[in-house]
Interface confidence: medium
């Protein structure tokens, strides 16, 4: 029998099926638009309705914005004509593409609006430290919904260089784990890039002021970061799992990181940051158990252990 | 840190136009909404509009719709307001702020005066 | 455009006393979608340019002395300064950012006996 080509597949029926959505997670900035995508494949053709908050959500009823709608798609863009839109279309957000067969649903989407970010207004006071004692310089960024990115710089642009006395944290901190004279500056800056904005912003400059001293006095290690001596935390299969110990002294302290439990797995593990940071890549069953740092000097030596539990993501 | 310094005072008569400048720093320029806002001599605070340097889009409160014009130019991070067919009313405190659609308008510029007088 | 009316136009209090005053809004100023007041409050001294104090009516702005306060919601809004200090001498002003056009109260005048 032959069939001919205009018939066939011509009474096939597919249930919808979700083949491209937004993220779990939108963050929307003021001078964004607002971009929900849903896209599916069914046979009849799907149609397309939104929830938000659970309730029928129909963006071109919505007053006072411009939207676009695909043909044939359930994506569409809310154009942002005023600095409060974003505000306005919070909320969680679900796709559900419907035919003769049935209907497919989206994850839920939480969409958020997030102010440009801002450093809070503040008179930063100068740090006043003797030559060979640790120093802490703060960051606190500003709380984001989105990753960003931390590099302390001066006011002529420059990379306050990095080592294993002068490190900044995962927190964005500058540690020294001892002052030299030749730290005294009075323009540490802390720049945050928030990469969903666009947008760099920097903290007031620090004056560090060092005060010189005849004889540098030798101390055994301390830990600055973590300050206790263990903790706890748990790990997402797959993901990755990032340690970290920052310790100060004189002569400055270097870390070991050691495995009580069992051995290191070598092949997925990175050191960085001089040694102060463990990196452990796509974290499995196995990875479970105590890791410990270590760090040296001619005086002594300070320790801390991180207990991980390893759970299912 | 943020500043917003605005251009130097103006004296008009009236039916001419003025055009203002609002110089930004300190921060990512297209991040933010501008706005305008003027205040007269013992009056209150008036919105005039707003625009998005990203895109240039704008809004206008209606009162000032067909006299006032809001631009930007990113390349020096600075946006304009000019106002045609000046009246003595006009006469007024003029000011540029941000506003990011989150936290209010927390940043202000020092303010233009301008007065218009035959 | 929501009016925004505020009250007394004027008050003189001594150093040191609590003082209140009022905003009222002719419609509500609560969004659903985040639950929040689209309500400032500005401060402005003499020849300055307005500065923020209060966002969303509650949230102090950082820098702002904790002797400031607001509170309120839907379309009546208060500003309380717990223990006045010569420096506030001030005009004060609200202001609605939830629908445009952008409105202001007329401002409460704040001197000192």
């Known amino acids: 029998i032959q069939i001919p080509e205009e018939y066939e597949g011509h009474h096939v029926m597919e249930p919808p099926v979700i083949t491209e959505q937004s993220p779990r997670r939108l963050v929307v900035f003021p001078t964004d638009d607002i971009s929900l995508k849903c896209e599916a494949s069914g046979k009849p053709e799907v149609q397309f309705r939104w929830t938000r908050d659970g309730v029928h959500f129909k963006p071109k009823e919505e007053l006072g914005v411009t939207v676009y709608q695909s043909p044939h798609s359930g994506s569409f863009t809310i154009t942002g004509n005023n600095s409060n839109f974003a505000q306005r279309f919070q909320g969680i957000y679900r796709c559900f593409a419907s035919n003769k067969l049935g209907t497919a649903m989206s994850h839920e989407i939480r969409l958020m609006a997030e102010g440009a970010p801002k450093w809070p207004k503040e008179t930063v006071k100068p740090v006043e430290v003797e030559e060979g004692e640790s120093v802490v310089l703060p960051c606190n960024p500003p709380p984001s919904a989105e990753p960003l990115r931390i590099y302390w710089m001066n006011s002529k642009i420059l990379h306050i260089k990095q080592d294993e006395r002068v490190t900044m944290g995962q927190n964005g901190n500058l540690y020294f784990a001892n002052v030299l004279t030749s730290d005294n500056h009075s323009d540490y800056i802390c720049h945050a890039h928030f990469p969903g904005t666009r947008t760099i912003i920097q903290k007031e400059p620090i004056d560090l002021r060092v005060k010189a001293t005849n004889s540098m006095i030798d101390r055994k290690p301390r830990l600055l970061f973590p300050t206790n001596s263990s903790s706890h935390l748990v790990a997402l299969q797959g993901q990755p799992l990032v340690l970290e110990c920052i310790a100060e002294g004189f002569p400055t302290p270097t870390i070991k990181w050691l495995r009580p439990s069992g051995p290191m797995p070598a092949d997925r593990v990175t050191y960085q940051n001089h040694n102060k940071t463990l990196q452990l890549l796509k974290v499995g069953e196995e990875d479970d158990g105590e890791y410990r740092c270590l760090a040296e000097n001619s005086l002594g030596s300070a320790r801390h252990a991180y207990y991980v539990t390893v759970e299912a993501a | 840190q943020v500043q917003l310094v605005q251009s130097g005072s103006e004296l008009k008569k009236p039916g001419a136009s003025v055009k203002l400048s609002c110089k930004a720093s300190?921060?990512?320029?297209?991040?933010?909404?501008m706005q305008w806002v003027r205040q007269a001599p013992g009056q209150g605070l008036e919105w005039i509009g707003e625009?998005?340097?990203?895109?240039?889009?704008?809004n206008y409160n209606e009162m000032f719709k067909s006299r006032a014009v809001l631009s930007v130019d990113t390349s020096v991070s600075t946006a304009y307001m000019q106002l045609c067919s000046l009246k003595a009313e006009d006469t007024a405190v003029y000011y540029c702020?941000?506003?990011?659609?989150?936290?209010?308008?927390?940043?202000w510029g020092q303010g233009t005066l301008v007065t218009v007088s035959s | 455009d929501i009016v925004m009316t505020q009250s007394p136009s004027s008050l003189a209090v001594s150093v040191g006393e609590r003082v209140t005053m009022s905003c009222k809004s002719s419609?509500?100023?609560?969004?659903?979608?985040?639950?929040?007041?689209?309500l400032a409050w500005y401060q402005q001294k003499p020849g300055q340019s307005p500065k923020l104090l209060i966002y969303?009516?509650?949230t102090r702005e950082s820098g702002v002395p904790d002797r400031f306060s607001g509170s309120g919601s839907g379309t009546d809004f208060t500003l309380t300064i717990s223990s006045v200090k010569a420096e506030d001498v001030a005009l004060y002003y609200c202001?609605?950012?939830?629908?445009?056009?952008?409105?202001f109260g007329q401002g409460t005048k704040l001197e000192i006996k």
């Open positions: 702020a941000l506003y990011d659609g989150y936290y209010a308008m927390d940043y």
């Open positions: 300190g921060y990512t320029f297209t991040s933010y909404w």
């Open positions: 625009i998005n340097p990203s895109n240039g889009r704008t």
């Open positions: 419609q509500s100023l609560l969004y659903s979608s985040n639950q929040k007041n689209y």
């Open positions: 969303w009516a509650s």
């Open positions: 202001q609605q950012y939830h629908s445009y056009p952008f409105t």
